[in-house]
């Protein structure tokens, strides 16, 4: 049975303090993973009892395991059904626990009643607050039954059910006619599926006689133990103030359990704790008497005390649930009450017995639940015990179940029922998933949903390059954790699998289906260097590149340029698509802006190291455009140019700069200063002799302008070839601004 | 054998100036980009500047802008750092080192020149 | 600025052991990390470039691994003359960053 249990406090002086705390002993509860199971839910049911509505409860979770529910403002927001729900998958368990007004007209005398299947239930209605009208039964919210106000027996209404079966399960309440439902008895009834002793899909199996009041699941077979009990049978006390199936849990405060009451998986029910008692659990148990609701007698003999928590307390020499047996009869020794094995092993387990005269090998045998008894093939005597070593053939599914270790000797005999779990290794269902790859590099998220039984405690990733014949690498991971597959071969596919294990001996489970994964292209290595870049205009920047000069083929698909513009916080990036590319032309900059300027080689989709960054200011907008230019060939290496001053100016100009180029000729344009501003006309010398040339001009003032027009001109005659064209020296400094 | 040879460290006084010169030699200089690595005593590693293989691009890291100037003379296979408005801070052992074509670590150091400030 | 984390910054072995020396970046700087060692009065020497890659005349018994942020350099089986100062550097991004160091000693 799962491992869960709802605690009510019902300390009720005042309903603020009152709380509802769901607890799992589940590996894993409430993670909310899919592969580790969805969290603890913990809820009022108001489909059966509906209360008037309040503020919302608040809902606390304490980890993965426990959750509390409170702010109940006032008496009746407690009354009714709650649930809680827990652990994964097939497994998924709802308890449920049912709160009774204790101010209400009428009372159960017990709240939960479990029955087998064809009882006969009986449910008893105590009256509180007398009231002479006829009393309603209802079952799950609907009309069940109506007894006459005169029919109650000794101050109780009685409802008969004969022949019960699963289906009756449910709420029960009575209440007095045309009285407030808060003030009805409400129960709740629980029909095992099987009678009395038996489980099973056909009832066929034989239950393994739970003690202490332990109720057996007629699904599984299995006890469900009352609070402050463990063990397969629930043959063993925990110590006070414990509880859960290993008695692993606490409970809160000073005073332990009282005042508390447990709700465990159907079919127990709820109860008090060990050693408690009464409609609030607040009385201790009457002495001879113990255990959960102090339903259990001692009768202790041999001189053994009662102990309201654990039973009898056997004094040396005696042992047994009455101190009933002498030590002298054989006696098994600390078996543990569960095993756990993985399928196809072939485990051995060790049965310990002492007594008078002592066992021996051939004294202790070990039964599967099939009947078939092995022998021990090998024995361990000590001076206090025997130790019986059986070694059990290859576990198949069927041998989950009750096995039990039996002692025999002239002295008498003990046994000891156990319960085996053969479980299934998990296989994963899915292969696993490709985070991120890089060029010698793949992060794998391992963690699938598989078939068998988790936990998983280690993930095995096998991998090898597709098509490959050679041994599959492995890497063992954290389940939790996403995987780096390193040094790797670049653009390569590899074939991925998951092997998943659970613990324990054999529990690795078979391989999981494959997926191809392919590591990214290799990075480009080179680092481009930044040799230059001039101002083309307030908007234009051309840059220029290098790369080191290195043997074999270019790793690189093109060039990024980034132009980062701190002031404003914006990024420009231009990509050059040719990898022989070592210049650009950058437009539609920000006039008057300071940009720091790298370049990376890029491949694929990866980027190579940057260059060191290079700053450059951008001059600020420039005047407007000369007006008029014309060309007039003077001679045969000179032109003439002229034209009026731009119109509107922001400002004095500082100089002109003329662009020459020869008409369809594919070299760079030249620029020549005119740094006489108050000039409308200059002379270019040194040109060719018949040859056409374009020509344009622009201002600059801080910043450099607009460009003119352009205009055309040929020089004359059949002069010599010249050196190149120069500006009338007219200035004392005239150049070229590159 | 390929190696480079500093020079030019010593003491000089807060505010002071002085200039380191790194003669390469066994490799074809104009090549490949270089770069200045400093390393205060008992400390750490720090880039100071780097150039590339033609000259035409510098850069400096923030503790040394507008004071430091590296530069590289190709006809005569050396590189200069040239170290002005010197402080306390700048107090460490200077190297310079050739940038690897490929991987662009750093594969040749020369020896190190120390370099203190102090009034 | 991308920072370089190096740890331990003090690992004390014995020759012959295996010696395991990690490198973190504050950001991914790809495959683009060297290593290098330096002794005490001498110039620092590269080990291992863009990662896994041995420089030219380092012994087999150094290796390099990782990319993206976490980066290991191991020697395999200590000598005497490997006792000494390691440095990894990024050149993903400038200002180039060196890590502070692990100094490597004799147990």
């Known amino acids: 049975a799962v491992d869960l249990t709802l605690l009510a406090n019902l300390r009720l002086t005042d309903p603020q303090r009152f709380f509802l705390t769901c607890v799992s002993g589940e590996a894993g509860a409430g993670r909310g993973s899919d592969a580790w199971g969805p969290p603890l839910l913990l809820e009022k049911d108001d489909r059966i009892v509906r209360t008037p509505p309040g503020p919302p409860l608040r809902l606390a979770r304490n980890g993965s395991h426990q959750v509390t529910l409170r702010g109940f403002s006032k008496p009746s927001d407690l009354v009714g059904v709650f649930s809680c729900v827990g652990g994964a998958g097939a497994r998924r368990t709802r308890v449920i626990y049912v709160h009774n007004s204790p101010g209400a007209h009428l009372l159960p005398d017990k709240v939960t009643h479990t029955v087998n299947k064809g009882d006969t239930a009986v449910l008893s209605a105590r009256v509180h607050k007398e009231k002479q009208t006829d009393v309603i039964w209802k079952s799950n919210g609907s009309y069940f039954y109506t007894l006459d106000w005169h029919e109650a027996q000794d101050g109780r209404f009685l409802l008969q059910l004969p022949n019960v079966q699963p289906p009756s399960s449910g709420i029960y309440s009575a209440t007095y006619l045309e009285a407030s439902p808060l003030g009805s008895a409400f129960f709740r009834l629980i029909v095992r599926g099987c009678g009395a002793g038996r489980w099973g899909p056909g009832c066929t199996k034989e239950c393994p006689g739970c003690l202490h009041g332990g109720v057996c699941h007629d699904h599984d077979g299995e006890c469900v133990c009352p609070p402050g009990f463990t063990g397969t049978r629930c043959e063993q006390a925990c110590r006070e103030g414990r509880f859960g199936q290993s008695c692993q849990e606490q409970c809160p405060g000073i005073s332990g359990c009282r005042g508390l009451t447990f709700c465990l998986p159907d079919p127990y029910g709820c109860s008090c704790g060990s050693g408690w008692r009464g409609s609030q659990c607040q009385e201790a148990c009457a002495p001879g008497h113990f255990g959960a609701d102090c339903r259990l007698q001692c009768q202790c003999q041999n001189g053994g005390t009662c102990d309201r928590f654990s039973g009898c307390v056997c004094p040396s020499g005696w042992h047994g649930v009455h101190c009933e047996k002498s030590d002298r009869i054989p006696q098994i020794l600390n078996m543990a009450s569960e095993l756990e094995f993985n399928l196809e092993t072939m485990p051995r387990i060790n049965c310990a017995a002492a007594g008078n005269p002592f066992p021996v090998r051939g004294s202790i045998e070990l039964r599967k639940p099939d009947g078939t008894v092995l022998l021990s093939t090998k024995a361990i005597v000590e001076p206090e015990k025997t130790t019986a070593e059986f070694e059990v053939p290859r576990l198949v599914l069927a041998d989950s179940g009750f096995w039990e270790c039996r002692v025999s000797t002239s002295g008498g005999q003990d046994s000891r029922r156990f319960k085996v779990n053969v479980k299934v290794p998990p296989v994963p269902l899915a292969a696993p998933r490709l985070l991120t790859k890089q060029s010698r590099q793949l992060v794998v998220s391992p963690l699938v949903s598989f078939s068998g039984d988790g936990p998983i405690s280690t993930v095995r990733l096998h991998y090898r390059p597709q098509d490959s014949t050679m041994d599959w690498s492995t890497i063992v991971v954290d389940p939790s954790e996403n995987v780096t597959l390193m040094n790797l071969r670049p653009k390569t596919g590899y074939s991925v699998r998951v092997q998943l294990s659970r613990p324990g001996e054999g529990g690795e489970g078979a391989w999981g289906p494959p997926t191809l994964m392919t590591t990214d292209c290799p990075e480009p290595l080179l680092q481009p260097w930044l040799e230059g870049w001039h101002v083309e205009g307030t908007d234009r920047l051309r840059v220029s590149w290098s790369l080191p000069l290195v043997p074999g083929p270019l790793v690189g698909d093109g060039f990024l340029l980034r132009l980062w513009d701190g002031t404003r916080g914006q990024e420009r990036r231009e990509n050059v698509s040719s990898p022989q590319a070592r210049t650009a032309l950058l437009t539609g900059l920000t006039p008057g802006t300071h940009y720091q300027l790298d370049v990376q080689l890029y491949h694929c989709t990866l980027l190579g190291p940057a260059s060191p960054p290079a700053h450059v200011l951008l001059p600020p907008s420039g005047p407007p455009a000369p007006r008029h230019l014309h060309a007039q060939a003077l001679s045969d290496s000179e032109i003439q140019l002229t034209w009026k001053h731009p119109e509107a100016l922001p400002g004095p100009i500082s100089k002109y700069v003329v662009e020459v180029q020869v008409a369809g000729g594919a070299g760079d344009p030249l620029w020549i200063d005119v740094d006489r501003p108050e000039e409308t006309s200059t002379i270019i010398r040194g040109l060719n002799a018949s040859t056409r040339y374009l020509f344009r001009m622009r201002a600059s003032i801080q910043g450099l302008g607009d460009w003119s027009n352009t205009v055309e001109e040929s020089t004359l005659g059949n002069g010599l070839q010249a050196e190149g064209p120069v500006q009338e020296s007219r200035a004392a400094e005239e150049g070229l601004d590159q | 054998e390929v190696q480079l040879l500093e020079s030019g460290g010593g003491l000089v006084q807060p505010g002071g100036s002085l200039r380191l010169s790194c003669a390469a030699s066994?490799?074809?200089?104009?090549?490949?980009?270089m770069i200045w690595v400093r390393q205060a005593p008992g400390k750490g590693l720090e880039w100071v500047s780097v150039i590339s293989p033609s000259g035409g691009h510098t850069s400096y890291a923030d503790s040394v802008k507008g004071r430091f100037t590296i530069s590289r003379d190709n006809s005569k296979n050396t590189l200069y750092l040239q170290m002005n408005s010197l402080r306390a801070e700048d107090t460490a052992v200077y190297y310079c080192?050739?940038?690897?074509?490929?991987?662009?670590?750093?594969?040749?150091w020369g020896q190190g020149k120390m370099v203190t400030v102090s009034s | 600025d991308i920072q370089m984390t190096q740890s331990p910054a003090t690992l004390s072995l014995s020759p012959g052991e295996r010696a395991t020396l990690s490198c973190r970046a504050s950001q991914s700087v790809s495959i683009y990390l060297a290593w290098y060692q330096q002794k005490p009065g001498q110039a620092p020497r590269l080990l291992i470039y863009d990662a896994s890659n041995r420089a030219t005349d380092i012994p087999a018994r150094f290796s390099g691994s990782g990319s993206g942020t976490d980066f290991t350099l191991t020697i395999s089986s200590l000598e005497p003359e490997d006792f000494a100062v390691y440095y990894c550097q990024q050149r993903s991004s400038w200002p180039i960053t060196f890590g502070l160091g692990t100094r490597l000693e004799i147990k």
């Open positions: 066994g490799f074809t200089f104009s090549q490949y980009p």
């Open positions: 080192a050739r940038i690897q074509y490929y991987g662009g670590a750093f594969d040749i």
